[in-house]
Amino acid sequence: LQDPCSNCPAGTFCDNNRNQICSPCPPNSFSSAGGQRTCDICRQCKGVFRTRKECSSTSNAECDCTPGFHCLGAGCSMCEQDCKQGQELTKKGCKDCCFGTFNDQKRGICRPWTNCSLDGKSVLVNGTKERDVVCGPSPADLSPGASSVTPPAPAREPGHSPQ
């Protein structure tokens, strides 16, 4: 015999108190699959969490973090402090990327600049704390007499010594 509850679609629940008829999920609750005997309570995005997507009868609310923070975890269960581009979050807080590394996002770690010479290329644009170097054509690609691209010396920013 087929379970009568299996006919209840998402957004409803199988109401045992009403001869197993399909009742709509009450306000602030949802069921994302059919055949459910209860609806789940909607997540509320409070405090540092803000609503990215409202709850509907068939899907839970989705949260993200207030400006200055970014999500961690499945479904944004925690918020972590942003840093600026050119920084990484360390145990001492946000710190500038060391010389020779960069971070172009407000989260994550500083990564080494691309080593253009490994690909036989030259440096077209120097790297910064916020941006990777841009590699140019390999010296062999430059025909004799063509304007050569001289790899500039790595520009050290004032007060930003190697660490």
């Epitope: 409070k46 405090g47 540092v48 923070f69 961690l72 975890g73 499945a74 269960s77 925690m78 972590e80």
Partner: antibody
């Protein structure tokens, strides 16, 4: 820097109420939920409840639902916890703490002693 | 409610020792696990959040790992200031719940 400063120690009689305060500084008070946690002498940590200062919305541990009331005054960046019908086993240190999905900053705690 | 079982409840160790504290949840908490340190004076500090992320200012001798229901706090080389009580806490569901604590004492 971010700081939570709690009110001073209280000695109260059984059956009475106590209202504790937690003053926040160094961040936007309304932007973070405030949670309250207690620790009885020699015991572990127990969650009482939380308040969203922006909306006044609260969540309570069922154990405290009938006796705890959480409020917040955003104009002075202060959260409050009132506990009524006090019993001797409510003797504990009460902490407020800011929530990011983890409790990153804690108040210094307020000792409440329930004694006749 | 999600139960958090922490072990051992107390532990004697010496400066320089490697120490491991474990925490088991009664259901999958999807890495939503945090660790706190409480000194005898009562002050509570966050050490690690989201299983393994070190909070600002916490020395790198502290580390966390785990998934599902089983989680671990490790102190790689104990320092005199590490003798304290440690608590785990889950943020997967309300009510937030804590482990019973591990008191780390000097041998």
């Amino acid at each position: 820097q971010v700081q939570l400063v709690q009110s001073g120690a209280e000695v109260v009689k059984p059956g009475a109420s106590v209202k504790l305060s937690c003053k926040a500084s160094g961040y936007t008070f309304a932007g973070f939920e405030m949670h309250w946690i207690r620790q009885a002498p020699g015991q572990g940590l127990g969650w009482i409840g939380a308040i969203d200062p922006k909306t006044g919305g609260t969540d309570y541990n069922q154990k405290f639902k009938d006796r705890a009331t959480l409020t917040a005054d955003t104009s002075i960046s202060t959260a409050y916890m009132e506990l009524s019908r006090l019993r001797s086993d409510d003797t504990a240190v009460y902490y407020c703490t800011r929530d990011l999905g983890y409790f990153d900053v804690w108040g210094q705690g307020t000792l409440v002693t329930v004694s006749s | 409610d999600i139960q958090m079982t922490q072990s051992p409840s107390s532990l004697s160790a010496s400066v320089g020792d490697r120490v491991t504290i474990t925490c088991r949840a009664s259901q999958d908490i999807r890495s939503n696990l945090n660790w706190y340190q409480q000194k005898p004076g009562g002050a509570v500090k966050l050490l690690i959040y989201y299983t393994s992320r070190l909070h600002s200012g916490v020395p790198s001798r502290f580390s966390g790992s785990g998934s599902g229901t089983d989680y671990t706090l490790t102190i790689s080389s104990l320092q005199p200031e590490d003798f304290a009580t440690y608590f785990c806490q889950q943020s997967e569901k309300l009510p937030r719940t804590f482990g019973g604590g591990t008191k780390l004492e000097i041998r």
